[in-house]
């Protein structure tokens, strides 16, 4: 009795965060025995797409010529071989930016901060939103979500950082979103350059934990230390 077929690999090019209107290609790579590939979107009422494999049959291409809200979501793929369907791939989360107008990102009291002091990054949206996301350029993942309680919508979210070290320096952007789909994000805010000066250095955290000086598992986004976020919002990280 042969074991289950190995699961395929699923990825997106040029990446999994795509601006509205841009093209994206989803690839599913299985085995040379694959006869057909299938892409399923989470909670959709039917198979999303099916494709014949490209030679030499070990992968298939699913093209999205123009990214829209329809395509944002969580995907898995499968392949069919002569003995049946494979296990599902690990999920791919396809996020669309540009669903809402861009928020404004600012630093309080100033984007120029002395090491060891505190700074708060403030993300403000024109219309009330219930999720705010802070990212740092070249970070491995989004740094932090702030999501409102009970669907209460806010115009802003605060991301406090304390104490600041040199590793907090860099370029930040924020996004806003509505809770009904965290796969739909606003346009990015204009970039904010956070400049850390002075020599009051504590222990250097791992670069992948760029918002926090707290210890934690490698490659995990951690909560910033310090004050409570803007009223009505709770910290939430993926």
């Amino acid at each position: 009795q042969a074991g289950p077929l190995p699961k395929p690999t699923l990825w997106a090019e040029p990446g999994s965060v795509i601006s509205w209107g841009n093209s994206v290609t989803i690839w599913c790579q299985g085995t040379l025995e694959a006869r057909e590939y299938r892409l399923d979107k989470e909670e959709s009422p039917a198979p999303w797409d099916r494709q014949n494999p490209l030679e030499p049959k070990n992968k298939a291409r699913f093209s999205i010529p123009s990214m829209t809200e329809d395509y944002a979501g969580r995907y898995r793929c499968y392949y069919r071989s002569p003995v049946g369907w494979s296990q599902p791939s690990d999920p791919l989360e396809l996020v669309m930016t540009g669903a809402y107008s861009k928020p404004t990102l600012s630093a309080l009291p100033s984007p120029l901060v002395t090491s060891g002091k505190s700074v708060t990054l403030l993300c403000q949206s024109r219309s009330p939103m219930d999720t705010f996301l802070l990212i740092k350029e070249r970070a491995a993942h989004p740094l932090l979500h702030l999501r409102s309680e009970h669907g209460a919508q806010q115009h802003q979210a605060e991301f406090p950082m304390s104490p600041v070290t040199s590793v907090h320096g860099g370029t930040y952007r924020c996004f806003s979103s509505h809770g009904f789909s965290h796969y739909l994000l606003s346009h990015p805010s204009d970039p904010l350059e956070l400049i850390v000066s002075g020599s009051l250095e504590g222990p250097r955290p791992s670069p992948t934990r760029s918002v926090s000086t707290a210890a934690g598992p490698e490659d995990q986004p951690l909560m910033p230390t310090g004050s409570v976020p803007h009223s009505g919002l709770r910290r939430h990280w993926e």
């Epitope: 999303w48 797409d49 329809d70 009904f180």
Partner: antibody
Framework: QVQLVESGGGVVQPGRSLRLSCAAS????????IHWVRQAPGKGLEWVAV????????YYADSVKGRFTISRDNSKNTLYLQMNSLRAEDTAVYYC???????????????WGQGTLVTVSS | DAVVTQESALTTSPGETVTVTCRSS?????????ANWVQEKPDHLFTGLIG???NRAPGVPARFSGSLIGDKAALTITGAQTEDEAIYFC?????????FGGGTKLTVLG
């Protein structure tokens, strides 16, 4: 041309069982999901259940969950609905309707059968 | 359970544009509801018109289009014809089940 033909309806007492069939032709049955949809006399449509092309995904309306079972035999191009513990409120014309091959390339509920009447009465 | 609401009846004239809407009791209709439109002609003849990812079924005239307008799904007939007189049902998907609206009886005054 695409054809869906339902059969198996009739008069049945409350609490009893009935099995409906839907014979498909004119398309590659094994590529498509299929729905059961019902319409009570003088009422609108009520979705009952769907089964995906390979039979591995099945979804049901809350009103029939645990009582009805959807299944298919791709070698016979036939869809089934096993209805147990029937109630008076299950009285309706039952239709099978074709689903999509894939959402990016089709329209759910595109072709329908002519329906089969199920009457649940003592 | 979700309830899907449509206008019970609409009347239009040939050549006019008419819009049938579909509202969800759970909030705004979104792309995740995969709004679907089905036409019922006399003698219980049903045909799927629009659904999936904004697809129009083969053979369905281009005057039929689907969209999201505000918090509702909409079926627009641009330049209605007398043969468009029918009952139109919308169906919305809720993660693991479909729910049909009550149907809209469209009368096209000839």
């Amino acid at each position: 041309q695409v054809q869906l033909v339902e059969s198996g309806g009739g008069v049945v007492q409350p609490g009893r069982s009935l099995r409906l069939s839907c014979a498909a032709s004119g398309f590659t049955f094994s590529n498509y999901g299929i729905h059961w949809v019902r319409q009570a006399p003088g009422k609108g449509l009520e979705w009952v259940a769907v089964i995906w092309f390979d039979g591995n995904n099945k979804y049901y309306a809350d009103s029939v969950k645990g009582r009805f079972t959807i299944s298919r035999d791709n070698s016979k191009n036939t869809l089934y609905l096993q209805m147990n513990s029937l109630r008076a409120e299950d009285t309706a014309v039952y239709y099978c309707a074709r689903d999509v091959i894939t959402l990016v390339r089709g329209v759910p509920f595109d072709y329908w059968g002519q329906g089969t009447l199920v009457t649940v009465s003592s | 359970d979700a309830v899907v609401t449509q206008e019970s009846a609409l009347t239009t004239s040939p050549g006019e544009t008419v819009t049938v809407t579909c509202r969800s009791s759970t909030g705004a209709v979104t792309t995740s509801n995969y709004a679907n439109w089905v036409q019922e002609k006399p003698d219980h003849l049903f045909t799927g018109l629009i659904g999936g990812i904004n697809n129009r079924a083969p053979g369905v005239p281009a005057r039929f289009s689907g969209s999201l307008i505000g918090d509702k799904a909409a079926l627009t007939i641009t330049g209605a014809q007398t043969e468009d007189e029918a009952i139109y049902f919308c169906a919305l998907w809720y993660s693991n089940h479909w729910v049909f609206g009550g149907g809209t009886k469209l009368t096209v005054l000839g």
